[in-house]
């Protein structure tokens, strides 16, 4: 899915109102020095691509994030504010249902959620090089087109 035409401000609002708090709850009890963020993103569509991948794609040692509250709210926000996103996710949802297991919070999952928090930080405030980086924030209440 190409996240270029999402309403980034609405997604950001959804993140700050609820998703961020769910991520903090998930990470509660974890030391702030425990994980080093290794996944990065360069602009908002790229950040959403990485966020989607880490949130919904099972990885070795962490297969259950998609069932967490923050994941369900992330999916809802993308479905509402990214035109055509829902249609692209039907097959992925079916596959996810087949792969369901009981929820287990592993250290690998905690590390992955720490990565997610970092990706969301960059989504909320892209740090772009100044030369030709007018797309730090676009005008409000319209779809955003980024060219990189």
């Amino acid at each position: 899915y190409d996240f270029t035409n999402c309403d980034f401000e609405k997604i950001k609002a959804a993140y700050l109102s609820t998703i961020s708090k769910d991520l903090i709850t998930y990470m509660s009890g974890t030391k702030s020095t425990e994980f080093n963020n290794t996944v990065s993103c360069s602009n908002r569509p790229h950040c959403l691509t990485e966020i989607q991948s880490l949130t919904f794609n099972p990885t070795a040692g962490c297969a259950s994030l998609a069932k967490e509250m923050f994941a369900m709210k992330t999916k809802a926000a993308l479905a509402i504010w990214c035109p055509g996103y829902s249609e692209t996710q039907i097959n992925a949802t079916q596959a996810m249902k087949k792969a369901r297991k009981s929820k287990v919070t592993t250290n690998k999952c905690l590390e992955q959620v720490s990565q997610l928090q970092g990706l969301w930080r960059r989504f909320n405030r892209p740090l772009l090089k100044q030369q030709g980086s007018s797309d730090y924030k676009d005008d409000d209440d319209k779809h955003h087109h980024h060219h990189h």
Epitope: E9, A13, S20, N36, N37, R121, Q130
Partner: antibody, heavy 119, light 107 residues
Framework: EVQLVQSGAEVKKPGSSVKVSCKAS????????IEWVRQAPGQGLEWMGV????????NYNENFKGRVTLTADKSTSTAYMELSSLRSEDTAVYYC????????????WGQGTTVTVSS | DIVMTQSPDSLAVSLGERATINCKAS??????VTWYQQKPGQPPKLLIY???NHYTGVPDRFSGSGSGTDFTLTISSLQAEDVAVYYC?????????FGQGTKLEIK
């Protein structure tokens, strides 16, 4: 506990440079942006720039016309702000600050470093 | 650059009364506004982020509102420890900019 500890006060001559350090502890240094803000005596706050210690990416306030350089040393969890071609108007308290967990604010601040520029 | 203009420059309010500080942006900053409190000789402290979200440990008497270009910080019942200078900041576009500050005193 998250802490940002800055280097001590400096007195500099006009035309010279100053380098202020900001040592971070209590969190993974490379995961959060470090901001630099200054405050002239009796004045308000002025954002100078930001660095991502993870990859060295920066964004500067162009009002400083290339006089500011931000760097970060991951091995010592220390960020640096260098300001060149100093003039008397650069006399100020210089603060480093960390972005918060959402990336939308500055939650932890250093104690400030007073830089005095005088001939 | 986006200019953030606070009003009033200074404000005197009686203990227990409501204090209201306004911040106007020269162009829309969506909801990307933060409020800080600064006391003499100290660095600023984060109060409110993204217009209306309380930072951890900030008392409920502090609240933020607004969107677009007009924003407000309200202290519902002024306490002695609230005497400080308050700054709004926009993080919608580089360079990030602050308001000039509002000095809050007790009447």
């Amino acid at each position: 506990e998250v802490q940002l500890v800055q280097s001590g006060a400096e007195v500099k001559k006009p035309g010279s440079s100053v380098k202020v350090s900001c040592k971070a502890s209590g969190y993974t240094f490379s995961n959060y942006l470090i901001e630099w803000v200054r405050q002239a005596p009796g004045q308000g706050l002025e954002w100078m720039g930001v660095i991502d210690p993870g990859n060295g990416d920066t964004n500067y306030n162009e009002n400083f016309k290339g006089r500011v350089t931000l760097t970060a040393d991951k091995s010592t969890s220390t960020a640096y702000m260098e300001l060149s071609s100093l003039r008397s108007e650069d006399t100020a308290v210089y603060y480093c600050a960390r972005e918060d967990n959402t990336g939308t604010a500055f939650d932890y601040w250093g104690q400030g470093t007073t830089v005095t520029v005088s001939s | 650059d986006i200019v953030m203009t606070q009003s009033p420059d200074s404000l005197a309010v009686s203990l227990g009364e409501r204090a209201t500080i306004n911040c106007k942006a020269s162009q829309s900053v969506s909801s990307d506004v933060t409020w800080y409190q600064q006391k003499p000789g100290q660095p600023p402290k984060l109060l409110i982020y993204y217009v209306s979200n309380h930072y951890t440990g900030v008392p409920d008497r502090f609240s933020g509102s607004g969107s677009g270009t007009d924003f407000t910080l309200t202290i519902s019942s002024l306490q002695a420890e609230d005497v400080a200078v308050y700054y709004c900041q926009q993080h919608h576009r580089f360079p990030l900019t602050f308001g000039q500050g509002t000095k809050l005193e007790i009447k």
